[in-house]
């Protein structure tokens, strides 16, 4: 599995999407887990509804939500109020009994809020790492615009 990078801004929400073959994984619950070290276990953060037919219902664990479009084949994870400690390697999983198939490996990067002028020295930025050389970056930076804010800087 290649690793897909999702970048979010500290304090904002980040949406991670994991596409999958809806028939191949039909009837299977899904989960979002955090990888503990490169070879360590993947610790479950949140999983979809116990009843597969209700997988579309959003389930929360703390600031992390999961919802599954079982017909379209897209698992969506929302990390609300993103914090530096949320950065790291995660997996979207398809569950089958006590087995878990990896749907996607995800590297979450937390960027400093450009409007936050506090010291950003403690924010985690991934260094160059061999395992992420082939990583596909999905720029998921999104935040709501403040009233009257210009979406893009004017061009001269």
């Amino acid at each position: 599995h290649n690793t897909t990078v999702f970048q979010g801004v500290a304090g904002q929400s980040l949406q991670v999407s994991c596409p999958y073959d809806s028939m191949k994984h039909w009837g299977r619950r899904k989960a979002w887990c955090r990888q503990l070290g490169e070879k360590g276990p993947c610790q479950r953060v949140v999983s979809t509804h116990n009843l597969w037919l209700l997988s579309f219902l959003r389930r929360w664990n703390g600031s992390t939500a999961i919802t599954d479009d079982t017909l379209g084949g897209t698992l969506t994870i929302t990390l609300r109020n993103l914090q530096p400690h949320d950065a790291g390697l995660y997996q979207c999983q398809s569950l089958h009994g006590s087995e878990a198939d990896t749907l996607r490996k995800v590297l979450v990067e937390v960027l400093a809020d450009p409007l936050d002028h506090r010291d950003a020295g403690d924010l985690w930025f991934p260094g160059e790492s061999e395992s992420f050389e082939d990583a596909h970056v999905e720029h998921s930076i999104s935040r709501s615009l403040l009233e009257g804010e210009i979406p893009f800087p004017p061009t001269s």
């Epitope: 191949k24 039909w26 597969w52 009994g97 087995e99």
Partner: antibody, heavy 122, light 108 residues
Framework: EVQLVQSGAEVKKPGESLKISCKGS????????IGWVRQMPGKGLEWMGI????????RYSPSFQGQVTISADKSISTAYLQWSTLKASDTAIYYC???????????????WGQGTMVTVSS | EFVLTQSPGTLSLSPGERATLSCRAS???????LAWYQQKPGQAPRLLIY???SRATGIPDRFSGSGSGTDFTLTISRLEPEDFAVYYC?????????FGRGTRLDIK
């Protein structure tokens, strides 16, 4: 009618190769996992492995890993089980079966082929 | 791997009687992932019960499944002549998928 039709009985010598087939019809072949099950003479059922014809994702039982190869050709809705070097102990009936996709319990074998008898004898 | 132990190995009963077949797992199985099959001589197995207690399409209601954890039961409430066969339980909770060794149901 949903069915799996397997190729006919085979008689082979030890050391020979063999590929048996399982053709699905009456349903979307690429959307269901297909499993292979061995039944040695007078014995029970043994799961060998499964394949998802949609993308050829294959899983093997540790007991059969490296002993057989499972493959599929989705263009003709057919799954295969093959041996490169047969042994006398491979003599058995081999069944292909479709994994059901009942919500909450995908994995039970709801449709079975009629079985292919493979005899390996010198 | 999960080992499924079926008992008894052979059960001899008469038509009209009640049959109770047991399947015990070496580890806890999610009920969703236990199935029962019937196999008659010279035929492929046939799915009877999935999710431990749900009857497959076309299976008569005299067949019922129950149990959870490590102990599962297939009950045939009133035996018909065509029910005499070999019955297998199967788990697909964990890879590799495993079957029990079977219970042979004979006519007494």
């Amino acid at each position: 009618e949903v069915q799996l039709v397997q190729s006919g009985a085979e008689v082979k010598k030890p050391g020979e190769s063999l590929k048996i087939s399982c053709k699905g019809s009456g349903y979307s072949f690429t959307s269901y996992w297909i499993g292979w099950v061995r039944q040695m003479p007078g014995k029970g059922l043994e799961w060998m492995g499964i394949i998802y014809p949609g993308d050829s994702d294959t899983r093997y039982s540790p007991s059969f890993q490296g002993q057989v190869t499972i493959s599929a050709d989705k263009s003709i809705s057919t799954a295969y089980l093959q041996w490169s070097t047969l042994k006398a102990s491979d003599t058995a009936i081999y069944y292909c079966a479709r994994h059901d996709i009942i919500p909450a319990a995908p994995g039970a074998f709801d449709i079975w082929g009629q079985g292919t008898m493979v005899t390996v004898s010198s | 791997e999960f080992v499924l132990t079926q008992s008894p190995g052979t059960l001899s009963l008469s038509p009209g009687e009640r049959a109770t077949l047991s399947c015990r797992a070496s580890q806890i199985i999610s009920s969703n992932y236990l199935a029962w099959y019937q196999q008659k001589p010279g035929q492929a197995p046939r799915l009877l019960i999935y999710s431990a207690s749900s009857r497959a399409t076309g299976i008569p209601d005299r067949f019922s499944g129950s149990g959870s954890g490590t102990d599962f039961t297939l009950t045939i409430s009133r035996l018909e002549p065509e029910d005499f066969a070999v019955y297998y339980c199967q788990q697909f909770d964990s890879s590799p998928i495993t079957f029990g060794r079977g219970t042979r149901l004979d006519i007494k």
